[in-house]
């Protein structure tokens, strides 16, 4: 009933909670001298299902018949009309349709950790869009049976909240949940489970790394456990690893030796329990506990490169340059790189520590054979050193590579071709390929690059510190045993014209002849490497087209000799720079006027 | 002090229902586990029927179906609804209580600490 219903009453039959598919009988009765005011044969009772008229009739009681209601709840209404009057509210009714509740499904129940509590869950089934009450039910040994009953509208989840205990851990539990609504019951199939079965450990906490003499090889991984557990997985990675690495061990008592991480590196551990070898299931992975292995001495060498300069007639520059070892090979922090320097004849030795630098440049006399031993040392010592002999890499021109070509590889790449020397190609015992920025200068303290290459190998993709746009002067030298030959070009992985031409600064002349001498265009306005310069005159104020000379581009050269200008005649002069790509615009315009006689 | 004072024993025909009360003082019934123990003459205690803290009932299954335990949270009491009596119910009924939170631990006397001094129920053919 919905209000107080004093004019008259609602019956619903056969019930207020009916199946989906059911027909109601809903009765609509006026209590006695409760219809309209003068003339009982003229009420008329409305039903209104929500607010749209269903049905009415003339007299003290309607009865309609309604079927096809949809699941949920349908509020019927009856009201009453009287002649010049607005309908009065009777009484109400609501009905409730529904079905019966499916067998609960894949019953299963938990206990996180050995004082965690028995929880259960379930599948429902379909909405019963009923009040539908779920019961959960214990079966366990010596006669007893725990139950608790479900509050929730929607239930699929009951934690007893107490705890099952070890004291018999094979003993037998049964589980069964039961729905029950209006309309009729049901109850799941029985889970029947052992302590053992349900009780999911807690993760393994206090994890721990031991480290016996600061050893990689001595290390023990140390955690505490709940009481029970029998069995645990150990995991563990480098943390900059997707993989992980997995270790099953049996009666652990929270500790195990682990014997093949690498040397100074960071690793993620975790741990995991069970109770039983073959029953229940692992405990959650613990927290994750980060700690980074000791260092051990570095393995591997140095790949040591170097250059010769000549100074003067007693003196040669040496740079030495070296590649830093790989992670995996320092196996350790860097400290400090030795390099040692010995006159091999006279056996005179100078060693140096470097620290932040992976080059070195000393000057030696030109006399004598000189070696250089480059190592990497860390905290716990130091890698093998590499030697060298300090030789004249290009001195051998029978060892120099052939036909060299540098062509660009898509972005920033840059293939570089050879053929192998005139002399014995099999006598080649490696090559290597290096490359820096074109300085016009020569600059010393451009940085250096290199690459090693098998000696049957005829070609090398360079990639390290390729630059857009930057022209850079490649060699390949062919080495064979304590002779070395090279060859030499320049190459870009992109060009496009220069942005700028040459700056003429000066125009002297000689002998009925000028020198034009001109300022190198700035490196980063090359735009990769130069060809060709081209120098342009023409008489002032004509309107002729420019002569013009072509000069093949060289790196140290900035001035060049015409000598086809008439004499007492004023010139115009400029210049322009060349890549594949294009020619640059204008330098500097620069007028002229040779003085010498006329032929 | 804590104390639980029981009512409602007395004499029934078998068939017949009773209702036990159990009333607390001194602690608060919703935080404890209530139980039900009984002891017929002769007989050791034994255990009736319990409800933990967290509203989970255990009962021996001789009276599943026919005892219900419940509690009032508002009246710090809890309530031993009998139906269908049989002789072999008679006994003195006992109202226990202790801070209880395994399963086993329900159906154990040793497991609670307060105790009524009991009433008794006679149900006779």
């Known amino acids: 009933k919905i209000d107080a219903c004093k004019r008259g009453d609602v019956t619903v039959k056969p019930s207020h909670v009916i199946l989906l598919g059911s027909t109601v009988n809903i009765t609509c009765s006026l209590k006695p001298r409760q219809g309209c005011f003068h003339y009982s044969r003229r009420n008329k009772l409305i039903l209104y299902k929500f607010d749209r008229r269903i049905n009415f009739h003339h007299g003290h009681s309607l009865n309609s018949q309604v079927t096809g209601l949809p699941l949920g709840t349908t509020l019927f209404v009856c009201k009453l009309a009287c002649i010049n009057s607005d309908e009065i509210q009777i009484c109400g009714a609501e009905i409730f349709v529904g079905v019966a509740p499916e067998q609960p499904q894949n019953l299963s129940c938990i206990q996180k950790g050995e004082q965690g509590t028995v929880a259960c869950t379930w599948e429902r089934g379909r909405d019963t869009h009923l009040y539908t009450e779920y019961t959960l039910q214990l079966s366990g040994p010596k006669n007893l049976t725990w139950q608790k009953q479900c509050k929730d509208i929607y239930c699929d989840y009951l934690d007893f909240g107490i705890n099952l205990t070890p004291e018999s851990p094979e003993s037998n539990f049964t589980a069964k949940v039961t729905a029950v609504n209006s309309l009729g019951s049901s109850s799941s199939l029985p889970s029947t489970f052992t302590f053992l079965d349900i009780v999911r450990p807690l993760p393994p906490w206090d994890i721990r790394i031991k480290f016996q003499k600061a050893s990689v090889s001595r290390c023990t991984l140390y955690w505490r456990d709940e009481g029970l557990v029998l069995l645990n997985r150990l995991r563990y990675r480098p943390s900059n690893s997707r993989l992980w690495n997995m270790v099953n061990v049996t009666k652990a008592k929270g500790r195990h030796d682990l014997l093949d991480l690498k040397p100074f590196t960071e690793y993620e551990f975790q741990i995991s329990s069970k109770l039983h070898l073959y029953k229940g299931s692992w405990s959650d992975w613990s927290e994750s506990l980060r700690a980074q292995t000791p260092e051990e001495e570095p393995t591997g060498m140095l790949d040591v490169w170097y250059m010769k300069r000549h100074i003067d007639y007693s003196r040669q520059q040496i740079s030495l340059f070296w590649k830093n070892l790989s992670v995996s090979e320092a196996r350790g922090k860097i400290l400090h790189y030795q390099v040692t320097l010995q006159e091999l004849t006279g056996g005179k030795a100078m060693t140096q520590n470097i620290t932040g630098h992976t080059s070195w440049t000393t000057v030696i006399p030109r006399t004598g054979n000189w070696a250089v031993a480059v190592s990497a040392a860390n905290s716990k010592g130091s890698s093998l050193p590499t030697r060298i002999n300090i030789m004249n890499l290009c001195e051998a021109g029978l060892l120099a590579p052939r036909q060299v070509s540098a062509n660009s590889e898509g972005m920033d790449n840059i293939l570089v071709t050879w053929q192998p020397p005139r002399k014995d190609p099999s006598a080649v015992q490696e090559y290597v390929v290096e490359w820096r920025e074109l300085h016009p200068g020569g600059d010393t303290q451009v940085p250096l690059n290199w690459l090693r290459s098998r000696p049957y190998n005829v070609s090398a993709l360079i990639s390290e510190n390729i630059k857009s746009y930057i022209c850079y002067e490649i060699r390949v030298y062919a080495l064979s045993g304590d002779q070395g030959g090279c060859s030499s070009i320049l190459g870009n992985s992109k060009h496009k014209a220069p942005l700028s031409g040459p700056h003429i600064n000066a125009i002297t002349e000689e002998k009925g002849s000028i020198l034009i001498s001109w300022n190198s265009i700035p490196v980063q306005e090359q735009m990769g490497c130069l060809l060709h310069y081209r120098i342009y005159w023409k008489e002032r104020d004509s309107n002729s087209q420019p002569q013009l000379c072509e000069i093949p581009y060289r790196v140290s050269q900035n001035s060049h000799p015409i000598n086809s200008l008439q004499p007492r005649v004023t010139y115009v002069l400029w210049m322009t720079a060349l890549t594949a790509a294009g020619e640059s615009s204008h330098g500097n315009e620069r007028e002229f006027c040779l003085q010498g006689k006329a032929n | 002090q804590v104390q639980l004072q029981e009512s409602g024993g007395g004499s029934v025909q078998a068939g017949g229902s009773l209702r036990l009360s159990c009333a607390v003082s001194?602690?608060?019934?919703?935080?404890?586990?209530m139980g039900w123990f009984r002891q017929a003459p002769g007989k050791e205690r034994e255990f009736v029927v319990a409800m933990s803290s967290s509203e989970t009932t255990v009962y021996t299954n001789s009276v599943k179906g026919r005892i219900t335990i419940s509690r009032d949270n508002a009246k710090n009491a809890v309530y031993l609804q009998m139906n269908a009596l049989k002789p072999e119910d008679t006994a003195v009924y006992y109202c226990?209580?202790?801070?209880?939170?395994?399963?086993?631990?329900?159906?154990?006397?040793?497991?609670?600490?307060?105790w009524g001094q009991g009433t008794q129920v006679t149900v006779s053919s």
């Open positions: 001194g602690r608060t019934v919703s935080d404890y586990a």
């Open positions: 226990s209580m202790g801070p209880i939170t395994t399963f086993q631990g329900l159906a154990r006397q040793n497991e609670y600490h307060y």
